[in-house]
Interface confidence: medium
């Protein structure tokens, strides 16, 4: 028998520095977790102790903190090189700055293979990107070889900016011929490494003949065997075992997100490359693991330029940006309108001639808006200003919901109106009318939404059985502020870009902003 140790990360999202337990900014260092310096300590410890070790990343290193805003992926290449990753799969967020923003800072600079079998380049891009990412890579490990085959969510064109010259194929259809090719090369130990979410990971394990292990990402899935060491609730045991269509037991793993855990999976293969056993658990990277001093020093060096960025002007406002709780928790506020407009603008994807855009709606809990911005400071807006408005380090995500769920959400928005509670919704692409004289749960008297399948966008009544795409904070997607109906009834959830980054990009693009209160949210009494 031959034993392989797979160390894996996924959805790190720019958390190069250690973070608090909820993966936001580290405040009390003695309680902080993760970060590349701590990760390196643990990886090195395992590399010294065990003979056959692979360090893999399942995508979405890009996007999530000011590190990505400033360094745009160069930080990913540099620190992944320093940690000596063996391979990485492309995630959807790796395309957030377009194909050029992937090629220049990451693909050209990475000293490890970057993989995806289901992304095919066409047109002029084909020759430009040729060889910079691969469908698979055969890696020597000790006296053996291991094949790593990559995959990426086929929803990427709706979630990011890959452009028109990359085709995202069905994962299973694309993976099978590449695995077959590896078999003809006498590679009998094959890992599928990719970024399509836990449901697709399980399907790959079931359907793709010849895949021995699946290492996934995208859905931030936490798996654990035994008592979990932190706040995350396991979605299943680690590894999650899938019985393939040809009767093999295929371990599937994921390691939550944000570099909080290091996935640790030990696989035993027989001489024909069959998995005999698999066991392990994610390792919580808490403060009991010291940060490696040389990587930490490197992080400190790179930090020097970040501090200065946060005070630079992004753009100007010529109006007061009312982010006060007195406004945003009671009525339409122009800060809420600004943020929602930025959220929609960040998700413009012209992928179908029938649709002007794939999503037109935004909802945002008023309690998530934490500060106004005064225009009398020469109109200047900085990252620092925006960090006061959106201090929680969340993301603006894409979900699919039925109209009936949205109706429930808007009823919840005003079910205890008047108590300055955070669930009051700010909106974009939605016109809502409330009648507060009616009993809670029956206060939404009009709910119109902006069409997407139209050349001239206009507002139509919400249809209860129709499925709608909505951009919202991850806080709401996870049921925060009492929006349990969103969490329980959402049909799809894809994590998006860092909240401050979305708004800062929009302000930089617009240069001068003047959001108004324009009748998106209205109150009435009496019959309709």
């Amino acid at each position: 028998a031959w034993e392989l140790t797979i160390l894996h990360t996924n959805d790190v999202h720019s958390r190069l520095e250690q973070t608090s337990e909820d993966s936001s900014k580290c405040v009390n260092a003695s309680r902080c977790m993760g970060g590349v310096a701590r990760l390196f300590t643990k990886v090195q410890q395992i590399r010294r102790a065990e003979p056959n070790v692979l360090l893999l990343d399942a995508g979405d290193q890009y996007q999530g903190t000011i590190w990505f805003t400033v360094y745009k992926g160069a930080e990913v290449a540099h620190f992944m090189n320093a940690l000596r990753y063996d391979a990485m799969a492309l995630g959807n967020h790796e395309f957030d700055n377009g194909v050029e923003g992937l090629i220049e800072p990451l693909l050209k600079e990475a000293k490890f293979p970057i993989l995806s079998a289901n992304i095919k380049a066409k047109g002029p891009l084909a020759s430009q990107i040729s060889g910079l990412y691969l469908p698979y890579k055969v890696l020597p490990v000790g006296d053996e070889v291991v094949g790593i085959v990559g995959y990426t969510s086929k929803e990427t064109p709706f979630l990011s900016n890959p452009g028109t010259n990359l085709v995202f194929e069905d994962e299973i259809t694309a993976l099978q011929p590449e695995v077959d090719k590896l078999k003809t090369l006498n590679v009998n130990k094959i890992i599928a490494l990719g970024h399509s979410g836990f449901e697709m990971d399980k399907l790959i394990a079931q359907k793709v003949r010849g895949v021995d292990v699946v290492v996934g990402g995208h859905s931030n899935t936490f798996l654990y065997t035994g008592n979990p060491p932190s706040k995350e609730v396991p979605a299943g045991k680690y590894p999650f075992i899938v019985t393939s269509d040809d009767g093999r037991k295929v371990p599937v793993v994921q390691a939550y997100a944000f570099g909080k855990y290091l996935g640790y999976l030990k696989i035993e293969f027989d001489e024909r490359g069959n998995v005999i056993s698999s066991h392990g658990n994610p390792i919580l990277l808490n403060s009991s693991i010291p940060e490696d001093p040389s990587i930490k020093a490197d992080i400190n060096k790179w930090r020097i330029k970040l501090d200065n960025y946060s005070t630079q002007e992004l753009g100007k406002t010529i109006v007061y940006l009312d982010g006060s709780s007195q406004s945003c928790r009671f009525r339409e506020c122009n800060m809420g309108n600004l943020i929602c407009d930025a959220m929609i603008n960040n998700n413009l994807r012209h992928t179908d001639e029938m649709f002007w855009n794939h999503v037109s709606m935004c909802i945002l809990n008023g309690g998530g808006i934490r500060s106004p911005i005064d225009e009398r400071n020469n109109g200047t807006i900085t990252w620092e200003n925006l960090a006061a408005v959106l201090p929680f380090g969340g993301t603006f995500d894409l979900v699919q919901l039925k109209g009936s769920t949205l109706k429930k959400a808007f009823e919840h928005s005003v079910h205890r109106y008047g108590q300055s509670t955070g669930e009051f919704l700010q909106v974009g692409g939605i016109h809502v009318v409330y009648d507060l004289s009616r009993k809670p749960g029956d206060r939404v008297v009009k709910l119109d939404v902006l069409c997407t399948k139209c050349r001239v966008p206009s507002y139509d009544p919400l249809k209860m059985d129709e499925v709608y795409k909505v951009i919202l904070p991850n806080f709401l997607a996870n049921g925060g502020d009492g929006f349990q109906m969103i969490k329980d009834e959402l049909l799809r959830h894809d994590s998006g870009d860092q909240d401050i980054n979305v708004v800062s990009t929009y302000i930089s693009k617009m240069k001068v902003i003047y959001p108004a209160v324009e009748g998106r949210i209205k109150f009435s009494t009496g019959s309709h």
Epitope: T69, A74, P105
Partner: antibody, heavy 122, light 111 residues
Amino acid sequence: QVQLVQSGAEVKKPGASVKVSCKASGYTFTSYWITWVRQARGQRLEWIGDIYPGSGNTNYNEKFKTRVTITADKSTSTAYMELSSLRSEDTAVYYCAKEGGLTTEDYALDYWGQGTLVTVSS
Amino acid sequence: EIVLTQSPATLSLSPGERATLSCRASKNVSTSGYSYMHWYQQKPGQAPRLLIYLASNLESGIPPRFSGSGYGTDFTLTINNIESEDAAYYFCQHSRELPFTFGQGTKVEIK
């Protein structure tokens, strides 16, 4: 090999502006900071500011903040430094330099342009 | 801003001798075991050339007779077995915080 080639000498009147260019080659332009430094005769080198071409982020010395603009054109791998409201004490050799911040050099200036003499005289 | 003071202003040596140049920072420029101090050589009419980065690391292509040391606020550039081609100005520079600053320079003359 890494090269930074700057534009030629300039003579300007007080109150005018000057824009100096710095064309980079031999490395990934978008991944390293470009710094601008000046040296007046007999004076110490003075850090003006820098730019990260990958994102266009800039840092400026407070002394020059109101008068200097540093930009970068990714398509031509060229950085620019524009100084306005020139006065006689701005007469100096202006250098661009590549910072080694993506390797262990950490913001040490590992490659320099040849320098551009800017003379401000009425 | 951090002020760097170099001494001596001028150093006159014969070939084969050792040159010791000093740079003192008005504030600590070291952290986590790293010192953000660098040394450059500049000859008349030429751009500066990086000699030493992070206080003690020799830049590639620089002869090993150049070395650097120091931590905190006091740093030294040493040139062993000095040669006539080493006649130049030598500057220190820190990168601990913005703005980065330079020392006023030490002129090294060869007799």
